[in-house]
């Protein structure tokens, strides 16, 4: 039994990081296979990570995490048995994947102006509270071409669009997403979607 | 939020103990370390330990090596630290303060008197 | 004693810039991370800077950290006469077993 595909990982950076690889042919993860983790630090206590598949020969884990703080640094050993397959390290905060955000609701009633809100994913305590910029991505349920993304580059989880910059009469769906730069994070998942219909008084022709 | 609220004030002779108790609330109490540190008056800051209140392991300055035991209990969200054989030098306010690399919370502080 | 040395005092006038160093050694400042905590008149001491350049949620931008080898500095900017205080940097020493060490403090007096 062979690692294919070493581990790769990434970190939410508040309680889970998610650790992804290879076998070089069918295995059954969580039987088979663990991964250990833990903390280069004093007093640190190692933890056991049971993976389960991801396709035939691939498995992935999830690692819980206490007090998730950019110092931290993991050591990572997978084991078949006695086994030692690999041995590595995973530094959460260079490998940041975002939280998604929550909680996205079109507000259509403010004279002709939609406003959307969500929830910021993360507790005011984490570093990313204050750093997460968003993706707002607005699209036509009838005109696959009306596609459009909206950057929200301040820290308020809100955007303010004119309801006349979409067509009247149809409905749409937006979701979000968010990154942070500070630690060159990817993008999150997109959060599920939400659904309205678009109505606005044209104005009247002179 | 997270609050650390330690007990109050004591006054002790030489010779004596101290018991130091700093309740936690506003999060996942095993999820965090606990420091403690001194500050005796008109001096700085002196760091005495450290406890993992998850498994309760410790490690302790050498200056405090066999005399300080810290310890917690989970019930309660509660950690502890015990200084014997007191001195008058041990007169200081006794702070905890939560984090791993830094300390990124801290109680009030505690005033410890010794006297005789 | 400590292992990390401080200025005893520094002073400015409000609005002006301020600096405090930290100089450690390679078992300390030069092979972790770096803290520091602000200590007003007969409160707790509070965090102010980690991991050597950020500030805690709440922190203005006007005070900063940096690092380079074994010594770290805070800086202060547009100084106000609530920033009056004891300064305290902090980092962990591994020179014997593990320790973390502050610094010998830092009177600060707002001119």
């Known amino acids: 039994m062979k690692v294919l595909q070493e581990p790769t990982c990434v970190s939410d950076y508040m309680s889970i990081s998610t650790c992804e690889w290879k076998m070089n042919g069918p295995t059954n993860c969580s039987t088979e296979l663990r991964l250990l983790y833990q903390l280069v630090f004093l007093l640190s206590e190692a933890h056991t990570c049971i993976p389960e598949n991801n396709g035939g020969a691939g498995c992935v884990c999830h690692l819980l995490m206490d007090d998730v703080v950019s110092a931290d640094n993991y050591t990572l050993d997978l084991w078949a048995g006695q086994q030692l397959l690999w041995k590595g390290s995973f530094k959460p905060s260079e490998h940041v994947k975002p939280r998604a955000p929550g909680n996205l609701t079109v507000h259509t009633n403010v004279s002709d102006t939609l406003l959307l809100t969500w929830s910021n994913p993360y507790p005011p305590d984490n570093y990313l509270y204050n750093h997460l910029t968003y993706a707002v991505n607005i699209w036509s349920e009838n005109d696959p071409a009306d596609f459009r993304i909206y950057n929200v580059t301040y820290l308020e989880p809100s955007l303010r669009i004119a309801a006349s910059t979409l067509k009247s009469g149809i409905s749409y769906r937006a979701r979000v997403r968010a990154w942070a730069q500070c630690y060159n994070t990817t993008w999150s998942e997109w959060s599920p979607s939400t659904k309205w219909h678009n109505s606005y008084r044209e104005p009247f022709e002179q | 939020q997270v609050q650390l609220v330690q007990s109050g004030a004591e006054v002790k002779k030489p010779g004596a103990s101290v018991k130091v108790s700093c309740k936690a609330s506003?999060?996942?109490?095993?999820?965090?370390?606990m420091h403690w540190a001194r500050q005796a008056p008109g001096q700085g800051l002196e760091w005495m330990g450290i406890?993992?209140?998850?498994?309760?392991?410790?490690s302790y300055a050498q200056k405090f090596q066999g005399r300080v035991t810290m310890t917690r209990d989970t019930s309660t969200s509660t950690v502890y630290m015990e200084l014997s054989s007191l001195r008058s030098e041990d007169t200081a306010v006794y702070y905890c303060?939560?984090?791993?690399?830094?300390?990124?919370?801290w109680g009030k502080g505690t005033l410890v008197t010794v006297s005789s | 004693q400590s292992v990390l040395t401080q200025p005893p005092s520094v002073s400015a006038a409000p609005g002006q810039k301020v600096t405090i160093s930290c100089s450690g050694g390679?078992?300390?400042?030069?092979?972790?991370?770096v803290s520091w905590y602000q200590q007003l008149p007969g409160t707790a001491p509070k965090l102010l800077i980690y991991?050597?350049?950020k500030r805690p949620s709440g922190i203005p931008d006007r005070f900063s950290g940096s690092k380079s080898g074994t010594s770290a500095t805070l800086a202060i900017t547009g100084l106000q006469t609530g920033d009056e205080a004891d300064y305290y940097c902090?980092?962990?020493?591994?020179?014997?077993?593990?320790?973390?060490?502050f610094g010998t403090g830092t009177k600060l007096t707002v001119l």
């Open positions: 991991d050597n350049n």
């Open positions: 902090g980092t962990w020493d591994t020179s014997l077993s593990a320790n973390y060490v």
């Open positions: 390679s078992s300390n400042i030069g092979n972790s991370y």
């Open positions: 303060a939560r984090g791993k690399w830094w300390l990124d919370y």
């Open positions: 506003g999060y996942a109490f095993t999820s965090y370390y």
């Open positions: 406890i993992n209140p998850s498994g309760g392991s410790t």
